[in-house]
């Protein structure tokens, strides 16, 4: 025999206190898929979550995060403070990066600058909190009679169109 | 199990600072929403602001311009301070967790267990 | 002020089913979810239903809730001596961005 909840579509659970028909989702609840017997409630996306997404009959709400903070976890579970460009979260909130170490973004660890050394060439340009430093040619391209080189654009954030 | 004490002093003067602290135990103060909820003697229950645990206030518009909630994650603490109190502010002082963003559904579920604080000379 | 409204007290016979009522607006009930909080004298509030009629885990089913537009209500079925305490109401309100309550209801078990 065909379980009668089988044919109650998303949107709609199959309500056992009404001989199993197929009742529609209370407000602030949802479900997603066909046969359910219970609809599960909306996410709510309050105080540092912003709606990017209502929630319907048959879908979640979808939450991202108040200007100044950025999603984590899985579906934006939860906001994490922005910082600025050069510095690092912290428990004690925003620090700069040490020396010898920068971060490019608002989120995310300070990292070590590039150790140009390594792979045999000489440092062009500097590092900074915000920036990496730059490698240069070899040592040894830099000779009396080595073409001259020209040093690379700066690396532009993605979505930012030249000044 | 999440617990939740609250500490500081009971008595405070008039035109002076309400500072207290609430201290969590039994689990982790991220990825919730920590509150402070105070309810004058024989009245209701009033928000006066809440915390997300990396950093985001909210304040009831009525104090905002006297409270401050901070947190300091790495103590598994948050703190109010509440600036210029009168005897209105008298009141059972309440620290809570509130899980209603991000996943979260049951709102204001973990309190503790209230401190009393007067205003008075 | 209380921003909800409840009525300030109810009463009923053991064994008897009570209602308590909330109303708000628009920007409180009428868009979220209510919780419904109980509190014995000298002690803290308690979650009793929360997302309208949602029962926390160890909480009865004696215990409902239910909301309708702007207006929400608790039903307590088969009243008992130890139901004697103040009922709260709550709602996030999208204005005020943050939870406001209603004034408490006390329950008196005649």
């Known amino acids: 025999l065909q379980d009668p909840c089988s044919n109650c579509p998303a949107g709609t659970f199959c309500d056992n206190n009404r001989n199993q028909i197929c009742s529609p989702c209370p407000p602030n609840s949802f479900s997603s898929a066909g046969g359910q017997r219970t609809c599960d409630i909306c996410r709510q996306c309050k105080g540092v979550f912003r709606t990017r997404k209502e929630c319907s009959s048959t879908s979640n709400a979808e939450c991202d995060c108040t200007p100044g903070f950025h999603c984590l976890g899985a579906g934006c579970s939860m906001c994490e403070q922005d910082c600025k460009q050069g510095q690092e979260l912290t428990k004690k909130g925003c620090k700069d990066c040490c020396f010898g170490t920068f971060n490019d973004q608002k989120r995310g660890i300070c990292r070590p600058w590039t150790n140009c050394s390594l792979d045999g060439k000489s440092v062009l340009v500097n590092g900074t909190k915000e920036r990496d430093v730059v490698c240069g040619p070899s040592p040894a391209d830099l000779s009396p009679g080595a073409s001259s080189v020209t040093p690379p654009a700066p690396a532009r954030e993605p979505g930012h169109s030249p000044q | 199990q999440v617990q939740l004490q609250e500490s500081g002093p009971g008595l405070v003067k008039p035109s002076e600072t309400l500072s207290l602290t609430c201290t969590v135990s039994?689990?982790?103060?991220?990825?919730?929403?920590w509150t402070w909820i105070r309810q004058p003697p024989g009245k209701g229950l009033e928000l006066v602001g809440y915390?997300?645990?990396?950093?985001?206030?909210s304040y009831n518009p009525s104090l905002k311009s006297r409270v401050t909630i901070s947190i300091d994650t790495s103590k598994n603490q948050f703190s109010l301070q509440l600036n210029s109190v009168t005897a209105a502010d008298t009141a059972v002082y309440f620290c809570?967790?509130?899980?209603?963003?991000?996943?979260?559904?049951?709102?204001?579920?973990?309190w503790g267990q209230g401190t009393t604080v007067t205003v008075s000379s | 002020q209380s921003v909800l409204t409840q009525p300030p007290s109810a009463s009923g016979t053991p064994g008897q089913r009570v209602t308590i009522s909330c109303s708000g607006s628009s920007s409180n009930i009428g868009n979220n979810p209510v919780n419904w909080y109980r509190q014995l004298p000298g002690t803290a509030p308690k979650l009793l239903i929360y997302?309208?009629?949602q029962r926390p885990s160890g909480v009865p089913d004696r215990f409902s809730g239910s909301k309708s537009g702007t207006s929400a209500s608790l039903a307590i079925s088969g009243l008992q001596s130890e139901d004697e305490a103040d009922y709260y109401c709550a709602a996030w309100d999208d204005s005020l961005n943050g939870w406001v309550f209603g004034g408490g209801t006390k329950l008196t078990v005649l």
């Open positions: 915390i997300y645990y990396s950093g985001y206030t």
């Open positions: 039994g689990g982790s103060i991220s990825s919730y929403y």
């Open positions: 997302s309208n009629n």
């Open positions: 809570a967790r509130d899980d209603y963003g991000g996943n979260g559904y049951y709102g204001v579920d973990v």
